[in-house]
């Protein structure tokens, strides 16, 4: 019996087609992805093949103005329209709190939404009961397939699930649910979830009875043969893990942003054992036409986005200096504003010992593309912020050793004075440079804001200590020459859309007046 698994993950609000780098589509003839194009390909496969499941491994939420405006209603609407068979909860599905998951998505989805390792307690338990499930048995042709879900247990540090959801260890939570499926005579079981490729592989290895793992969170690109675009494969598709009980378990992921549709064909024997698995992600490029009905619907929904982008988010009573002349040479108040917003967006009081789990932000000055003049009645709009942060990136959470941070700050000024983009703006950090010293030895003082303290204060950076830092995904991926961050980071979790972070902060503060306050000094 043959099953076709179509899968997406980490779509992050890319409902419209995008450029090849998953930013806003500029030249339509070269654009990719989007739900209208995805639907065309899915329907083509559904017509051609008998047993097809369309699955999503989480993080539909967060990433573009679509999510800012529609807050998840767009996810439910278009996933319903594409007739997804199941979805696993990702960490970003909790970005607007549990209510922001229940109302727009859980109550509106016409497909099961899954996670076996999230347990509700207190008053939430009855409110959310039945709205998401640990597993679902789906009829496919003449057979049944069990889908069991899982979600990153780091979600409380990455999003806003509140205090009434407990995120258990994935493997511990999955095993009894898989065992239950076995007692129900379900012998074909897919683990669908959002904990990253390393955990996907562990699940394949450790959870008895799981036949296939369809993952997300780490934006992993797997491919067999010559890859069709810019993404470099982390391994073959599917990635085969040998389980502890000796089975060959295929593990798949489909990069991110709806650029690819994962396509995996599995052959099962009559006892539900995987005999063979093969496939590849399908690049959703412009050779695949956009479905006219989904496209028409997208275009109807688009109008509210443009209206939103010109509305006032808040006011500034000071000039927001985002000029290259400032932000690439010295501390600039636009950099301070953005870093303050990044830290504010990551406030998670999850431990009495810590006022927060993260206190530090770094931001490449070259990523700040425009100032905002306060003389336009002080008004700040989404459109203004899109000029400041035009690249559609995310502000991510990483863990780095102090020694890596020191290297990053040396890199920040290694060729100072040439208006290059690597000059770092900061939050929760005090840095002093001596430009008379040779490159690579110019950081003379580097103090960082404590987290394990009731009164935050600045302490000298410790080289061997592991620190959490918020930074743009561009830096986490080694951009602007920050190769040491990419090479030495100990953990990397994708965060919220950059503009969304700053716009939410401005809306919250209502009136802003960021200053230049001595975060960056020259001796």
């Amino acid at each position: 019996w043959e099953l076709t698994i179509l899968h997406t993950n980490d779509v992050h609000s890319r409902l419209e087609q995008t450029s090849e780098d998953s930013s806003k589509c500029v030249n339509a003839s070269r654009c990719m992805g989007g739900v209208a194009r995805l639907f065309t390909k899915v329907q083509q496969i559904r017509r051609a093949e008998p047993n097809v499941l369309l699955l999503d491994a989480g993080d539909q939420y967060q990433g573009t103005i679509w999510f800012t405006v529609y807050k998840g209603a767009e996810v439910a609407h278009f996933m319903n329209a594409l007739r997804y068979d199941a979805m696993a909860l990702g960490n970003h599905e909790f970005d607007n709190g549990v209510e922001g998951l229940i109302e727009p998505l859980l109550k509106e989805a016409k497909f099961p939404i899954l996670s076996a390792n999230i347990k509700a307690k207190g008053p939430l338990a009855s409110q959310i009961s039945g709205l998401y499930l640990p597993y679902k048995v789906l009829p496919v042709g003449d057979e049944v397939v069990g889908i069991v879900g899982y979600t990153s247990k780091e979600t409380p540090f990455l999003s806003n699930p509140g205090t009434n959801l407990v995120f258990e260890d994935e493997i511990t939570a999955l095993q009894p649910e898989v065992d239950k499926l076995k007692t129900l005579n379900v012998n074909k079981i897919i683990a669908l979830g959002h904990s990253g490729f390393e955990m996907d592989k562990l699940i394949a290895q450790k959870v008895r009875g799981v036949d296939v793992v369809v993952g997300g969170h780490s934006n992993t690109f797997l491919y067999t043969g010559n890859p069709p675009s810019k993404e470099v494969p982390a391994g073959k598709y599917p990635f085969i893990v040998t389980s502890d009980d000796g089975r060959k378990v295929p593990v798949v992921q489909a990069y991110a942003f709806g650029k690819y549709l994962g396509y995996l064909k599995i052959e099962f024997d009559e006892r539900g054992n995987v005999i063979s698995s093969h496939g590849n992600p399908i690049l959703l490029n412009s050779s695949i036409p956009e479905d006219p009905s989904i496209k028409a619907d997208i275009n109807k929904w688009r109008i509210k986005l443009d209206n939103y982008s010109t509305q006032e988010l808040g006011k500034t009573i000071v000039y927001l200096d985002g000029s290259s002349q400032s932000c690439r040479f010295r501390e600039c108040n636009m950099g301070n504003l953005i870093c303050d917003a990044m830290i504010n967006n990551n406030l998670r009081h999850t431990d009495e010992m810590f006022w927060n789990h993260v206190s530090m932000c770094i931001l490449n000055g070259g990523g700040i593309r425009s100032p905002i003049d306060e003389r336009n009645n002080g008004t700040i709009t989404w459109e203004n912020l899109a000029a400041v942060l035009p690249f559609g990136g995310t502000f991510d959470l990483v863990q780095l050793k102090g020694s890596t941070l020191k290297k990053a700050f040396e890199h920040s000024v290694h060729r100072y004075g040439q208006s290059t983009g690597e000059f770092l703006q900061v939050g929760g950090i005090h840095v002093v440079y001596d430009l008379s010293r040779k490159p690579g030895d110019r950081v003379v003082k580097l103090d960082v804001l404590c987290t394990k303290c009731r009164v935050p204060s600045y302490d000298p950076l410790k080289m061997d200590e592991v620190y959490k830092v918020i930074l743009p995904n561009f830096l986490a991926n080694g951009g602007d020459g920050f190769q040491m961050i990419k090479d030495e980071l100990l953990r990397h979790d994708s965060g919220d859309q950059d503009i969304n972070v700053v716009s939410t902060y401005i809306s919250k503060m209502k009136v802003i007046y960021p200053a230049v306050e001595g975060r960056i000094k020259f001796s």
């Epitope: 339509a28 439910a76 609407h77 278009f78 319903n80 329209a81 007739r83 006219p292 009905s293 496209k295 028409a296 619907d297 275009n299 109807k300 929904w301 688009r302 109008i303 509210k304 443009d306 209206n307 010109t310």
Partner: antibody, heavy 118, light 113 residues
Framework: QVQLVQSGAEVKKPGSSVKVSCKAS????????ISWVRQAPGQGLEWMGQ????????NYAQKFQGRVTITADKSTSTAYMELSSLRSEDTAVYYC???????????WGQGTLVTVSS | DIVMTQSPDSLAVSLGERATINCKSS????????????LAWFQQKPGQPPKLLIY???TRESGVPDRFSGSGSGTDFTLTISSLQAEDVAVYYC?????????FGQGTKLEIK
């Protein structure tokens, strides 16, 4: 209130081009699709294409692809429809219409009669 | 392309009587995202642009008298005028609001008997 005011009637020779304008007022011009729909004398309605002035995104009906050009000038809140290689069967009233979230055509211009005659 | 076919082509109804116009689409107009049907009805009087009466197959546009109602689902739709008034004499069009290219029915001419 939403108003769409179109340019006046035109008489054109076969093979020539015509450019009809549609000036919008009473709303944020950049934020709503504007469609062009034509109606030949005594005939039904035929959608030609649409533009989203905010970013210039355009969809054309296949039938008119290559012969129609829809543009928008945000500075004057005006949409334009240019039809080239005119033939007698292009004689029609040409309407612009603004969409809303619930429907493509809740607001219409008054129409522009284009007569193609030698 | 979705083809919209109206019936009848013309219709004569007495004042105060019920008028019914049918519209059939070549493909389903059901929007699976919200389970509504993407169909609109327009009224056009001579020398005037069309006027939106009904959207979503059954929702009346604001200001439209409640004698106008729309029904149907999938591929079969109906516009009903419960009690015909003199000012309702016009041509009525259904429209595929669902899929590009946006298409109209050929029109139904409503007259007073």
């Amino acid at each position: 209130q939403v108003q769409l005011v179109q340019s006046g009637a035109e008489v054109k020779k076969p093979g020539s081009s015509v450019k009809v304008s549609c000036k919008a007022s009473g709303y944020a011009f950049r934020s709503y699709w504007i469609s062009w729909v034509r109606q030949a004398p005594g005939q039904g309605l035929e959608w030609m294409g649409q533009i989203f002035p905010g970013d210039g995104d355009i969809n054309y009906a296949q039938k008119f692809q290559g012969r129609v050009t829809i543009t928008a000038d945000k500075s004057t809140s005006t949409a334009y429809m240019e039809l080239s290689s005119l033939r007698s069967e292009d004689t029609a009233v040409y309407y612009c219409a603004r969409m809303d979230f619930y429907s493509w055509f809740p607001y219409w211009g008054q129409g522009t009669l284009v007569t193609v005659s030698s | 392309d979705i083809v919209m076919t109206q019936s009848p082509d013309s219709l004569a109804v007495s004042l105060g009587e019920r008028a019914t116009i049918n519209c059939k689409s070549s493909q389903s107009l059901l929007n699976s995202g919200n389970q509504k049907n993407d169909l609109a009805w327009f009224q056009q009087k001579p020398g005037q642009p069309p006027k939106l009466l009904i959207y979503g197959a059954s929702t009346r546009e604001s200001g439209v008298p409640d004698r106008f109602s729309g029904s149907g689902s999938g591929t079969d739709f109906t516009l009903t005028i419960s009690s015909l008034q003199a000012e309702d004499v016009a041509v009525y069009y259904c429209q595929n609001d669902h899929s590009y290219p946006l298409t109209f029915g050929q029109g139904t001419k409503l007259e007073i008997k």
